[in-house]
């Protein structure tokens, strides 16, 4: 048995940030799971990992330097990505693995989401440093 994953076909990342929701045909409540987001047709780059282990707190990390956070729903994980570059426009795939309780489950490969990064121009001018931060 494989978990089915639904993703938006395309998202536009304005201001270098995007929220990508991965919807699963499986309820993650009270499960030990590893949800991850992968970049590229071959899913070669693991962008972000959200690890859940019964506790209410998710562990989030990236081995590839992406700035990410996550949010858990009963049958979804939403990945929040920041500081994306225009050249990181690509197809991104959601992956899910359920480690406990048995049996181990993972997903059928989804269709992926094309994230089109439309970054703002990041050209600070020292003459106009902008507003102060409280």
């Amino acid at each position: 048995n494989k978990i089915l994953v639904k993703q938006s076909p395309m998202l536009v990342a304005y201001d270098n940030a995007v929220n990508l929701s991965c919807k699963y045909s499986y309820n993650l409540f009270s499960r030990e799971f590893r949800a991850s987001l992968h970049k590229g047709l071959d899913s070669a780059v693991e962008v972000c990992v959200v690890y859940g282990n019964y506790s209410q707190q998710l562990q989030v990390y990236s081995k590839t330097g992406f700035n990410c956070d996550g949010k858990l729903g009963n049958e979804s994980v939403t990945f929040y990505l920041q500081n994306l570059y225009v050249n990181q426009t690509d197809i991104y795939f959601c992956k899910i693995e359920v480690m406990y309780p048995p049996p181990y489950l993972d997903n059928e490969k989804s269709n992926g989401t094309i994230i089109h990064v439309k970054g703002k121009h990041l050209c600070p001018s020292p003459l106009f440093p902008g507003p102060s931060k409280p």
Epitope: Q57, L58, F66, N67, N83
Partner: antibody
Framework: EVQLVESGGGLVQPGGSLRLSCAAS????????MHWVRQPPGKGLMWVSR????????SHADSVRDRFSISRDNAKNTLYLQLNGLRAEDTAVYYC?????????????WGQGALVTVSS | EIVLTQSPATLSLSPGERATLSCRAS??????LAWYQQKPGQAPRLLIF???KRATGIPARFSGSGSGTDFTLTISSLEPEDFAVYSC?????????FGQGTKVEIK
């Protein structure tokens, strides 16, 4: 006035445990991501852990991921860091710092720090 | 992870002089760089964020510039209270990282 006050530091033996607290006041604590950053004696700053505003997600530096845990009690305006399996290289001043919900990792206010010494 | 290299390690100057501190990133971090001031026994204090924006209450003599991999903190005219350690920090990539610090000392 924003205030962050750490407590719970001290001398602990290798392999031991400690729990640091950070009491926050002067701002709406539940609106901010909170972090722990440490500074070994005579060295630079190093980010350790973070927790988001509602406590639902956390991240840790690789060097502490399996040993440290971060939590918060928004009703008490308090941030915690549980340090387990302490090693000599964990000896440092531990600072709590806040960051807003948009920048995540930009630390606009810091506490005075709590010294953790790991030695036998 | 991104490595931030600060130079010089120590800067010996007199009050009233101009201080120029450098921070170089091992890869591009856009403008996502902050500068902090730290005095002995005190908490770090945010001076500059997003490479060039002054935090609230920071005097105009502090300015930041740069983008990509090369960044500069300039103190136009050193005041006695400016002698401290200055650290840069990036938030572009995870995990956030700091430079090793530049100590500005009285000559």
């Amino acid at each position: 006035e924003v205030q962050l006050v750490e407590s719970g530091g001290g001398l602990v033996q290798p392999g031991g445990s400690l729990r640091l607290s950070c009491a926050a006041s002067g701002f709406t604590f539940s609106d901010y991501w909170m972090h722990w950053v440490r500074q070994p004696p005579g060295k630079g700053l190093m980010w350790v852990s973070r927790i988001n505003s509602d406590g639902s997600t956390a991240s840790h530096a690789d060097s502490v991921r399996d040993r440290f845990s971060i939590s918060r009690d928004n009703a008490k305006n308090t941030l915690y860091l549980q340090l387990n399996g302490l090693r000599a290289e964990d000896t440092a001043v531990y600072y709590c710092a806040r960051a807003d919900n948009t920048t995540w990792y930009e630390f606009d206010f810091w506490g005075q720090g709590a010294l953790v010494t790991v030695s036998s | 992870e991104i490595v931030l290299t600060q130079s010089p390690a120590t800067l010996s100057l007199s009050p009233g002089e101009r201080a120029t501190l450098s921070c170089r990133a091992s890869q591009s971090i856009s403008i996502y760089l902050a500068w902090y001031q730290q005095k002995p026994g005190q908490a770090p204090r945010l001076l500059i964020f997003d490479a060039s924006k002054r935090a609230t209450g920071i005097p105009a003599r502090f300015s930041g510039s740069g983008s990509g991999t090369d960044f500069t903190l300039t103190i136009s005219s050193l005041e006695p209270e400016d002698f401290a350690v200055y650290s840069c920090q990036q938030r572009h990539n995870w995990p956030p990282t700091f430079g090793q610090g530049t100590k500005v000392e009285i000559k």
